[in-house]
Interface confidence: medium
């Protein structure tokens, strides 16, 4: 399922992916001069099994002066209205890619490739972000973006970063330290369990929601 | 008044960390309130702001249960709390549980 | 927010009934109608303004986007009974109706 919307954007930053999840498409873009080939692909995609991913599919550009005098305009797929872009300079924290299974790496680049690369992302893809240069980097909570699906509606998580200029931060030394995502601390309170309701919702697909209550000493 | 409370709301039959789940209140008598929901893959969390701050929710993807809970409960808190999956709709529904909070 | 109109709406068996539900702001169509029987949990029935939740009989429909939706039960039935909320769900907070409860005439 692919991602219905641009990545979030931050103020004085950028994203790129580490890996890319199986799906992931990303188009075929040439440079200023160049076009693809004639019987080039629209696109490369991210394939795989259960033990290698791969981008299937080879961008080739050639130059546009050779071209024949047919005119050949570049369609781009239906599904793919929406733009997802990465800028191939930015540097971001390095990541063991080949430890992601169901994930490619950064595709190497092609010939005469543009400047710009136009991913559509899937579900369950993440992007992270850092500040561009110039700027440094107050961490709230995670530097990254998720793409979840829920209602039937695609929607990227909001990425906790403020990119603020290095005059103004100077008296904050080592906040641009990146903070891990956060995740669910686990309980560690003696509550008993007081009463448990079994009522079960029967479904078409079997799921299930049971509610009960647990009470805790206030401290 | 002032105890605190945490109830659960488990989940089975599909995916648990794939969908969010929620929570709504519903005073006597009174319409439904969206309270806030949880991914439990990687516990992001929303709250509405009339109950950020009131209430803590959370998730425990190991077994399949999200809680709501309050640190010190009031009289106001009395209402029924129902969790949710939201998927296409907020489609499945738990049955409820009545909190009742007295002196 | 969300309003809903009516508030109550008397009505008899078979009769054809129409409720109005207005955003403040265009929710595109991510809005949602839950069925609510009393002393039970809410039920979906439609959801993205129109579509309708497997297992809801096809007498209830839904329809509009941006403001304006409407949920319309083409021939009521003794278990239709109920109080009707509408909820969006474009942005948070989401946000549910005030309720329209349907009785019987």
């Known amino acids: 399922e692919l991602c219905d919307d641009d990545p979030p954007e931050i103020p004085h930053a950028t994203f790129k992916a580490m890996a890319y999840k199986e799906g992931t498409m990303l188009n075929c873009e040439c440079k200023r001069g160049f076009r693809r080939i004639k019987s080039g692909s629209l696109y490369m995609l991210c394939t795989g099994n259960s033990s290698h991913s791969s981008w299937d599919n080879q961008c080739q550009c050639t130059s546009s002066a050779t071209r024949n005098t047919t005119k050949q305009v570049t369609p781009q797929p239906e599904e793919q209205k929406e733009r997802k872009t990465t800028e191939m300079q930015s540097p971001m924290q390095p990541v063991d890619q080949a430890s992601l299974p169901g994930h490619c790496r950064e595709p190497p680049p092609w010939e005469n490739e543009a400047t710009e690369r136009i991913y559509h992302f899937v579900v369950g893809q993440m992007v992270y972000y850092q500040c561009v240069q110039g700027y440094r980097a107050l961490h709230r909570g995670p530097a990254e973006s998720v793409c979840k699906m829920t209602h039937g509606k695609t929607r990227w998580t909001q990425p906790q970063l403020i990119c603020t200029g290095e005059m103004e931060t100077s008296q904050f030394p080592g906040e641009e330290k990146p903070q891990a995502s956060p995740e669910g601390r686990p309980e560690s309170e003696t509550s008993c369990l007081v009463t448990t309701t079994d009522f079960q919702i029967q479904t078409e697909m079997a799921a299930t929601m049971e509610t009960s209550i647990f009470t805790t000493e206030y401290q | 008044p002032g105890e605190s409370l945490k109830i659960s709301c488990k989940g089975s039959g599909y995916s648990f960390t794939s969908y969010w789940i929620g929570w709504v209140r519903q005073m006597p008598g009174k319409g439904l309130e969206w309270m806030g929901i949880?991914?439990?893959?990687?516990?992001?969390?929303r709250y509405s702001p009339s109950f950020q701050g009131q209430v803590t929710i959370s998730a425990d993807k190991s077994i399949s249960t999200a809680y709501l809970q309050w640190s010190s409960l009031k009289a106001s808190d009395t209402a029924m709390y129902y969790c949710f999956r939201f998927g296409e709709g907020f489609d499945y529904w738990g049955q409820g549980t009545l909190v009742t909070v007295s002196s | 927010w969300m309003t809903q109109s009516p508030s109550t709406l008397s009505a008899s068996v078979g009769d054809r009934v129409t409720i109005t539900c207005r955003a403040s702001q265009s929710i595109g169509y991510w809005l949602a109608w839950y069925q609510q029987r009393p002393g039970r949990a809410p039920k979906l029935l439609m959801y993205?303004?129109?579509n309708l939740k497997s297992g809801v009989p096809s007498r209830f429909s839904g329809s509009g986007s941006g403001t304006e939706f409407t949920l319309t039960i083409s021939s009521l039935q003794p278990d239709d009974f109920a109080t009707y909320y509408c909820?969006?769900?474009?942005?948070?907070?989401?946000?549910f109706g005030p309720g329209t409860k349907v009785d019987i005439k």
């Open positions: 909820q969006q769900y474009n942005s948070y907070p989401f946000t």
């Open positions: 949880i991914y439990p893959g990687d516990s992001d969390t």
């Open positions: 993205r303004a129109s």
